[in-house]
């Protein structure tokens, strides 16, 4: 065509895949009549007629564009719908009169790739690899034109670096004409890269300008040899007998080496291997003072069979020994004195306390308790508590029972019991003294005796209520080497007047599940009469 060398650069029209391209014929009225135009596509320098305009009416030519072309803007613009990457070419319009002129349009097609898909090396990377090892792959699917990939480590772009960083990329053309970009990052990693965050970025262009998409960030498993081994003990701080203690071996290598924990034997001066659980943890539960000692950990690299030893760690399981009280079984006369002494050993400084067993009242802070002018009431339990103030919960106790010599002492002097005739009655009588008394009853029945403690005894009697018994009542007598004492139980028949709701009497009803003349397991519960306490 004459003058083709001087042709101006084609007009650029940019459009996204799937949208409509508007190809405006830029011929002026002087260059040609727009009511008589031929449209061509140019591919590999070959022109193909695709559309004719005659008297402002458009007609598609058979072929790949037949269904996608239409006229707009009073015939000046050709609309191409459903643009594909294959449409990226030159389109030209040619006017017929007064002389043949043409106007060229370069169609540029764009498509954003999908989100980049990053996959990290699932097997990890050793730091001593001979050459850069595959860290991760990045795939950007269905973009047009080919997007550019940039790899990042900790937010900084990675550059090719001989024998250190290598980025290998390739692209494939899908049947749609879109590109899939694949890239693999190879790098020589160091121990510090174990926490490094890698990601890939796709840079691409759209009609609206430059854009980018980032993959998610990934960390790659990094393998490095163990350089240091150490022991950790849980819980931290002071340990005591009874605690659950875990001695854990740790190493700075990945994967962790094989561990063994050993304890120094002070007598043989040799280390003895301890039995650890599957995780290489030595669990002491409950911890005992014998667990105290010097522990160390040995870590084995099973590939090289090189072993590393930790710094030894002294473990102290604090303890309080059994508490000893002297005298162990004190006996005293009324009015005399007593000194109780408490002893115990511990790995720490001890504090002693004396408490009254029955009331938990603190009597003395210190190992020695002195008691003067002993009364009968002073008999009973005294508890020595040996504790380590710096370790809460570390304490031991010992109970000692003090016996005061004296004749029997009755729990009550007299008691009234409400009964029904022919019921089986369960009566009880309690006495204390030192030596321990025995109890006898003045009536026949089934009696049983039980020790409440070394100085106290409780006797129960099952007896049938008879008219004679109602008349005489029941006596229990407690006796020991130093004397005797008696309690009386008065039996009163129940009648309706005794059970008025507003009655002021505080005597209780003896309940019975037995019917008359039956000797079943019927019981009678007694309530004490309000009376001054009688102590023999």
């Amino acid at each position: 065509v004459p003058g083709e060398a001087e042709q101006p650069a084609p007009e650029l029209v940019e459009v996204e895949v799937g949208s409509t391209a508007l190809l405006k014929c830029g011929l002026s009225q002087s260059q040609g009549n727009l009511s008589h135009v031929d449209w061509f596509s140019v591919h590999k320098e070959k022109r193909t007629l695709i559309f004719r305009v005659r008297q402002g009416q458009g007609q598609s030519e058979p072929g790949e564009y037949e269904q996608r072309l239409s006229l707009q803007d009073r015939g000046a613009t050709l609309a191409l719908t459903q643009v594909t990457p294959q449409d990226e070419r030159i389109f030209l319009c040619q006017g017929k009169r007064p002389r043949s002129q043409e106007y060229r349009i370069q169609l540029r097609v764009y498509k954003a790739p999908e989100e980049p898909n990053i996959q990290v090396n699932p097997l990890g990377i050793p730091v001593n690899s001979k050459e850069p090892e595959e860290v991760a792959t990045c795939v950007g699917r269905n973009g047009y034109p080919i997007p550019q990939v940039i790899w990042y480590k900790n937010g900084r772009p990675l550059k090719e670096e001989k024998n250190r960083v290598h980025i290998q990329s390739s692209q494939t053309v899908e049947s749609s004409g879109l590109y899939t970009l694949q890239s693999i990052l190879k790098a020589q990693l160091v121990k510090e890269d174990k926490d490094a965050q890698f990601y890939c970025e796709l840079n691409y262009r759209l009609p609206s300008g430059n854009h980018m998409k980032e993959s998610r960030e990934v960390t790659v498993p990094v393998f490095y040899p163990t350089e240091k081994v150490w022991l950790e003990v849980e819980p931290v701080g002071m340990l005591k007998e009874g605690d659950r203690v875990e001695i854990r071996c740790l190493a700075d290598g990945n994967p962790p080496p094989h561990f063994s924990i050993s304890k120094g034997n002070p007598s043989t001066r040799e280390a003895e291997e301890e039995t650890t659980n599957d995780n290489g943890v030595l669990v002491l539960e409950p911890a005992r003072k014998e667990h105290s000692g010097r522990y160390e950990c040995q870590a084995w690299n099973l590939d090289t069979m090189i072993s590393l030893l930790s710094e030894p760690q002294e473990l102290l399981v604090n303890y309080v020994s059994d508490v000893r009280v002297s005298p162990a079984a004190p006996e005293r006369q009324e009015g005399s004195s007593l000194t109780l002494t408490c002893e115990a050993e511990s790995s720490q400084d001890l504090e002693f306390q004396w408490l009254r067993e029955e009331t938990d009242q603190v009597l003395e802070r210190g190992p020695v308790l002195q008691l003067h002018d002993l009364k009968r009431e002073a008999g009973g339990g005294y508890r020595c508590v040996a504790s380590v103030p710096s370790i809460p919960g570390l304490n031991r106790t010992q109970l000692v029972k003090l016996a005061i010599f004296g004749p029997p002492w009755m729990a009550f002097k007299e008691r009234k019991v409400w009964v029904k005739e022919n019921m089986v009655l369960n009566l009880s009588c309690e006495a204390s003294g030192h030596p321990r008394p025995t109890i006898s009853w003045n009536v026949n029945g089934t009696a049983s005796e039980g020790d409440q403690d070394p100085q106290r005894v409780l006797s129960t009697l099952n007896v049938l209520v008879t008219p004679e018994l109602l008349e005489t009542g029941v006596e229990c007598t407690a006796s020991n080497d130093l004397g005797k004492n008696t309690s009386i139980l008065f039996l009163e028949l129940v009648n309706l007047t005794t059970l008025t709701p507003d009655s002021n009497t505080t005597t209780g009803l003896s309940t019975s599940t037995a019917s008359p003349h039956t000797r079943a397991n019927s019981t009678s519960t007694e309530r004490k009469l309000p009376e001054p306490e009688s102590r023999g």
């Epitope: 990290v120 699932p122 990377i125 795939v139 693999i184 498993p221």
Partner: antibody, heavy 118, light 106 residues
């Protein structure tokens, strides 16, 4: 085209060492990693070991102490040795190529059945 | 180790049926999953990689979906040659396979 072919004994005795060779063609061992995967009769697939394109070796921790994987790039061969064989190691052993831009196996050998029996 | 659990372990279907096979990972594996088909006496063949990408040369009736812990292989219209055992495989941390799903003719 890409091919992988396993070779080695079909029968080994308990406690003996198994040596399997995978000979590849259509690609270079320096561009693609190779794995060994086994499948006991009627059971699922189990990954055993791998060697990367850079020569790094990886093992399934369940067999680690018994395995060695190596390669001879000039012969395009990958060799797996497994010591102290046991009847439970009876399986079809496959070598498989790792896809260059991914971590899955895009080409497999036809497999070789190894029986462990006295 | 990451465990992969496939369901069902076997299923019967007819030519033309739509079939789905599920695979569950014991932890998040993002989309680091492949599906393989294995016929008796043959080596496995990769169908899907990266959870949803179709391997070159595999018919489009095969598709994969899911991410995180739950994944599905779908065959939109069963063909006679599709009766086989299917395995999922994770490549997020090490390599582990599911126990397989045997697809049989009804």
């Amino acid at each position: 085209q890409v091919t992988l072919k396993e070779s080695g004994p079909v029968l080994v005795k308990p406690t003996e060492t198994l040596t399997l060779t995978c000979t590849v063609s259509g690609f270079s061992l320096t561009s693609n990693g190779v794995s060994w995967v086994r499948q006991p009769p009627g059971k699922a697939l189990e990954w055993i070991a791998a060697i990367s394109s850079g020569g790094t070796t990886y093992y399934n921790s369940a067999f680690k102490s018994r395995l060695t994987i190596s390669r001879d790039t000039s012969k395009s061969q990958v060799v797996l040795t497994m010591t102290n064989m046991d009847p439970v190691d009876t399986a079809t052993y496959y070598c498989a190529r790792r896809y260059g831009y991914g971590w899955y196996f895009d080409f497999w050998g036809q497999g070789t059945l190894v029986t462990v029996s006295s | 180790d990451i465990q992969m659990t496939q369901s069902p372990s076997s299923l019967s279907a007819s030519v033309g049926d739509r079939v789905t096979i599920n695979c569950k990972a014991s932890q998040n594996i993002y989309n680091s999953l492949a599906w393989y088909q294995q016929k008796p006496g043959k080596a496995p063949k990769v169908l899907i990689f990266n959870a949803n990408s179709l391997q070159t040369g595999i018919p489009s009736r095969f598709s994969g979906s899911g991410s995180g812990t739950d994944f599905t292989l779908t065959i939109s219209s069963l063909q006679p040659e599709d009766f086989a055992t299917y395995y999922c495989q994770q490549f997020y941390s090490g390599y582990t396979f599911g126990q397989g799903t045997k697809l049989e003719i009804k």
